[in-house]
Amino acid sequence: KFSKQSWGLENEALIVRCPRQGKPSYTVDWYYSQTNKSIPTQERNRVFASGQLLKFLPAAVADSGIYTCIVRSPTFNRTGYANVTIYKKQSDCNVPDYLMYSTVSGSEKNSKIYCPTIDLYNWTAPLEWFKNCQALQGSRYRAHKSFLVIDNVMTEDAGDYTCKFIHNENGANYSVTATRSFTVKDEQGFSLFPVIGAPAQNEIKEVEIGKNANLTCSACFGKGTQFLAAVLWQLNGTKITDFGEPRIQQEEGQNQSFSNGLACLDMVLRIADVKEEDLLLQYDCLALNLHGLRRHTVRLSRKNPIDHHS
């Protein structure tokens, strides 16, 4: 029930924690499962047990195998198993899948990459970071405590990140590397009932007869990429294309904008050479998505020409 996979590279330090928990005061006995041989606690040994931790300083390929830990509490003993695999160092840059820790995802607002397993080691800064084997340089990358922060994350930042640090044990230093994949995702989006920003409900728009007029229908639908969201104009409850007045046209395509991070759409209605009969029409701005439809109505009124007195 309590088995945990651990892996490392030959000639690096590897520290494994017993999968069964216990208080620091509880004795933990470690055994090499295949031989049932007890792991020594003396630190002079290359492989030794230290409470809940099993230390390989450094690890060798021959150390691979299953190790048993027994936590001896005042009530019952509790047993865990550590399945340890030590691999030979790769000569090329590629990190094979079996050496990869869990993938983490980041976004523009949250781009922390934690160095896996580092909390088990006695390390001191600096922590070195590499992406696809290249040392990370530049002001966008900041190594902070046990994690890497990337400023202004872009999709190109996705890849395999390796942290490298030094473990110190009784004055001796051992190298440790750990690699994990980083993926870049869009910020979590959401959709909501359309909110029409313009025009206002029952707005009266002043126009000049004989001049051109533009009406803008603008609505927001949520955050992130939206599916099945649209804005459009209707004349007297009829689609513009079906109304049959060539002077009145919707602007081709819908302009997408992001206002305060919200996904919004605009549709402009263009009226050429405004006529008296246009003032009698009802102009409806419609915004619709999966949540439903919202309608704001606009009417046109004649703009009185300004009298110029001498």
Partner: antibody, heavy 121, light 107 residues
Framework: EVQLVQSGAEVKKPGESLKISCKGS????????IGWVRQMPGKGLEWMGI????????RFSPSFQGQVTISADKSITTAYLQWSSLKASDTAMYYC??????????????WGQGTTVTVSS | DIQMTQSPSSLSASVGDRVTITCQAS??????LNWYQQKPGKAPKLLIY???NLETGVPSRFSGSGSGTDFTFTISSLQPEDIATYYC?????????FGGGTKVEIK
């Protein structure tokens, strides 16, 4: 199938003695601690004590120490809970439960169906 | 003895609701805490051991968390068959002790 089967309901008078049983099957009886839990009418669960049938090692809750005896017969894979002199306050449901091995433990994972003990004059 | 304080003592929730029960130990018990379900007239049944591990065969809507002195048991989406009393139990020290129980009913 791993199971614990308890003896049937008992009705006794105050001062009488009683021994109830719990038979284990489907697992290595001597390798697991087995214990007893009391539940008085309408109340919660109270841990009484355990025995390791492999060597008859026992542990008791101070509340039940000296009040009851826990024993086991590994030849017939059965654990026992007994009273030498029952009291009305012993009226309860008694459950036996398996408590893990000498080297591993993860809760009271197998329970008997319970034995109702009624003590009334 | 380690005292285990469970709350609430009873609750009523609708089918599909998220239900949370807390258990507090009078001293540090690491993660040595189990959760049991007892249906009326039945023996208790182990649901969660070592604070957060789901016992084999137990539906994934049940979960547990916590360490030290504060623990939480959650039913993510209450089902009619979850009507029962739930108990926490520590096994860090003898005597093993149970919480007082939480009776869960359907509204």
């Amino acid at each position: 199938e791993v199971q614990l089967v308890q003896s049937g309901a008992e009705v006794k008078k105050p001062g009488e003695s009683l021994k109830i049983s719990c038979k284990g099957s489907g697992y290595s009886f001597t390798n697991y601690w087995i214990g007893w839990v009391r539940q008085m009418p309408g109340k919660g669960l109270e841990w009484m004590g355990i025995i390791y049938p492999g060597n008859s090692d026992t542990r008791f809750s101070p509340s039940f120490q000296g009040q009851v005896t826990i024993s086991a017969d590994k030849s017939i894979t059965t654990a026992y809970l007994q009273w030498s002199s029952l009291k009305a306050s012993d009226t309860a449901m008694y459950y036996c439960a398996r408590h893990g091995t000498s080297s591993d433990y993860y809760g009271l994972d197998v329970w008997g169906q319970g034995t109702t003990v009624t003590v009334s004059s | 003895d380690i005292q285990m304080t469970q709350s609430p003592s009873s609750l009523s929730a609708s089918v599909g609701d998220r239900v949370t029960i807390t258990c507090q130990a009078s001293q540090d018990i690491s993660n040595y805490l189990n959760w049991y379900q007892q249906k009326p007239g039945k023996a208790p049944k182990l649901l969660i051991y070592d604070a957060s591990n789901l016992e084999t065969g137990v539906p994934s809507r049940f979960s547990g968390s916590g360490s030290g002195t504060d623990f939480t048991f959650t039913i993510s989406s209450l089902q009619p068959e979850d009507i029962a009393t739930y108990y926490c139990q520590q096994d860090d020290n003898f005597p093993l002790t149970f919480g007082g129980g939480t009776k869960v009913e359907i509204k």
